[in-house]
């Protein structure tokens, strides 16, 4: 019973975590304009992995996709890759874990096979969570570096009366969503791995029992039964469903008035 609960909870936690990783990856608020120097700005900038946006106080929001692939910073590409790998691994892990759930009966699947699949999905969740945490942390580190660099030369035109204030960026909501989601996926993976140990039948050694029949001596010795733990080469072919990613090029969250871009 405890094993089923641990497995089920691990699955649910991982599911929430992966949904969070997907949400974080799609979010536009990975970095948001630092409002320390101007808390009442009429123009607010924020950036995601796929596009950058500007929200005016008027309520109009304009988003522009990063149409170049080669022109983007290597770090941003690395973060994108880590998040996508995390999502793909998590999605496969979810697919595997559905079939591995003890409460779900699929044909005559043995506990050994379920244990094997539970461990596989658990490892996938752990790696998925680590990918998300790593991706978000790399981006956060990049932000911190850029923040202090832009602070060092905050005012680039102090020669005369005219000031050119550089826009500084700080942590956006997506970073926190990503960290929490990565952590949940990681915890879910660990729970799946723990559940796997309970699912695997223990190795049982039956002691030899001698049966003495009257008349003639016959010793019946049943062989020691060895349960397959399923950690060997009990692998099955799995289909990977990779949904095509769609990106919105431009977004106008305002009653349309002009085509201006």
């Amino acid at each position: 019973m405890a094993v089923t609960a641990c497995q089920g909870l691990g699955f649910v936690v991982s599911l929430i975590g992966i949904a969070g990783i997907i949400a974080a990856t799609c979010m536009d608020q990975w970095s948001t304009q630092d409002l320390y120097n101007n808390p009442v700005t009429a123009v607010f900038n924020y950036q995601g992995l796929w596009r950058s946006c500007v929200r005016e106080s008027s309520g109009f929001t304009e988003c522009r996709g990063y149409f170049t692939l080669l022109g983007l910073p290597a770090m941003l590409q690395a973060v994108r890759a880590l998040m996508i790998v995390g999502i793909v691994l998590g999605a496969i892990g979810l697919l595997v874990s559905i079939f591995a759930l003890k409460c779900i009966r699929i044909g005559s699947m043995e506990d050994s096979a379920k244990a094997n699949m539970t461990l596989t999905s658990g490892i996938m969740f752990i790696v998925s969570g680590l990918c998300a945490i790593a991706g978000v942390s790399v981006f956060a580190n990049m932000l911190v570096t850029n923040f202090w660099m832009s602070t060092a030369n905050m005012y680039t035109g102090m020669g005369g009366m005219v000031q050119t204030v550089q826009t500084r960026y700080t942590f956006g909501a997506a970073l926190f969503v990503g960290w929490v989601a990565g952590g949940l996926t990681l915890i879910g993976g660990v729970m799946m791995c723990i559940a796997c140990r309970g699912l695997a039948p223990e190795e049982t050694n039956y002691k030899a029992v001698s049966y003495h029949a009257s008349g003639h001596s016959v010793a019946y010795k049943p062989g020691g039964f060895k349960a397959s733990t399923g950690f060997g080469s009990n692998t099955k072919n799995k289909k990977i469903y990779d949904g095509g990613a769609r990106t919105e090029d431009e977004v106008q969250s305002y009653p349309s008035k002009h085509d201006y871009v």
Partner: antibody
Framework: DVQLVESGGGLVQPGGSRKLSCAAS????????MHWIRQTPEKGLEWVAY????????YYADTVKGRFTISRDNPKNTLFLQMTSLRSEDTAMYFC???????????WGQGTLVTVSA | DIVMTQSPSFLTVTAGEKVTMSCRSS????????????LTWYQQKPGQPPKLLIY???TRESGVPDRFTGSGSGTDFALTISSVQAEDLALYYC?????????FGAGTKLELK
């Protein structure tokens, strides 16, 4: 057709109060940020206050902060400016304006004159 | 606060003439996020409220004649009327649309010679 009509102006004594109204029509009022802007021959155009579509955030010019209160009634399509502790320098033509692309004011009312004098 | 300085205060022109008025801000109005300049131009005729002409420094509002052109970036901006018409005689204001408080220039008055 977008229309903004201000009302409530008039002669007020220094230290007195006045409430200006701006009736909006011809557009979805609840979807736009609104402003009060005043004009005097001496100072020209001076931004007074801003209220976003959902009534938060609200910003004021330093010259009126603590004395003026901007508010709106979305179901009634009306914008308000409650003015207290009025001074002679508050004498001006008060316009309400709609906020649009580029943080510009694309529609203005005809204005209502507020005169602060003893 | 961002200070907007308009020059000249008065411009005396003849009909059909090309005219340029300038506006300078004490701080850059260029937003790095979308590379747009948050400067607006208005026209005000006597007894009327201001009318929006140009936003984002160079985008003409719908219905505004194409003889009106906004230009400039950062801190220096200009409004050009390619061929002044009698109905263009008015006060022209520039406005900082980048940060609160939203500030206006003192205006440039266009007069007939």
């Amino acid at each position: 057709d977008v229309q903004l009509v201000e009302s409530g102006g008039g002669l007020v004594q220094p230290g007195g109060s006045r409430k200006l109204s701006c009736a909006a029509s011809g557009f979805t009022f609840s979807g736009f940020g609104m402003h009060w802007i005043r004009q005097t021959p001496e100072k020209g155009l001076e931004w007074v206050a801003y209220i976003s579509s959902g009534s938060r955030p609200i910003y004021y010019a330093d010259t009126v902060k603590g004395r003026f209160t901007i508010s709106r009634d979305n179901p009634k399509n009306t914008l308000f400016l409650q003015m207290t502790s009025l001074r002679s320098e508050d004498t001006a033509m008060y316009f309400c304006a709609r906020f649009y692309y580029g943080n510009s004011f694309d529609h203005w009312g005809q204005g209502t004159l507020v005169t602060v004098s003893a | 606060d961002i200070v907007m300085t308009q020059s000249p205060s008065f411009l005396t022109v003849t009909a059909g003439e090309k005219v340029t008025m300038s506006c300078r801000s004490s701080q850059s109005l260029l937003n790095s996020g979308n590379q747009r300049n948050y400067l607006t131009w208005y026209q005000q005729k006597p007894g009327q409220p201001p009318k929006l002409l140009i936003y984002w420094a160079s985008t003409r509002e719908s219905g505004v004649p194409d003889r009106f052109t906004g230009s400039g970036s950062g801190t220096d901006f200009a409004l050009t009327i390619s061929s002044v018409q009698a109905e263009d005689l008015a006060l022209y204001y520039c406005q900082n649309a980048y940060s609160f408080p939203l500030t206006f220039g003192a205006g440039t008055k266009l007069e007939l010679k």
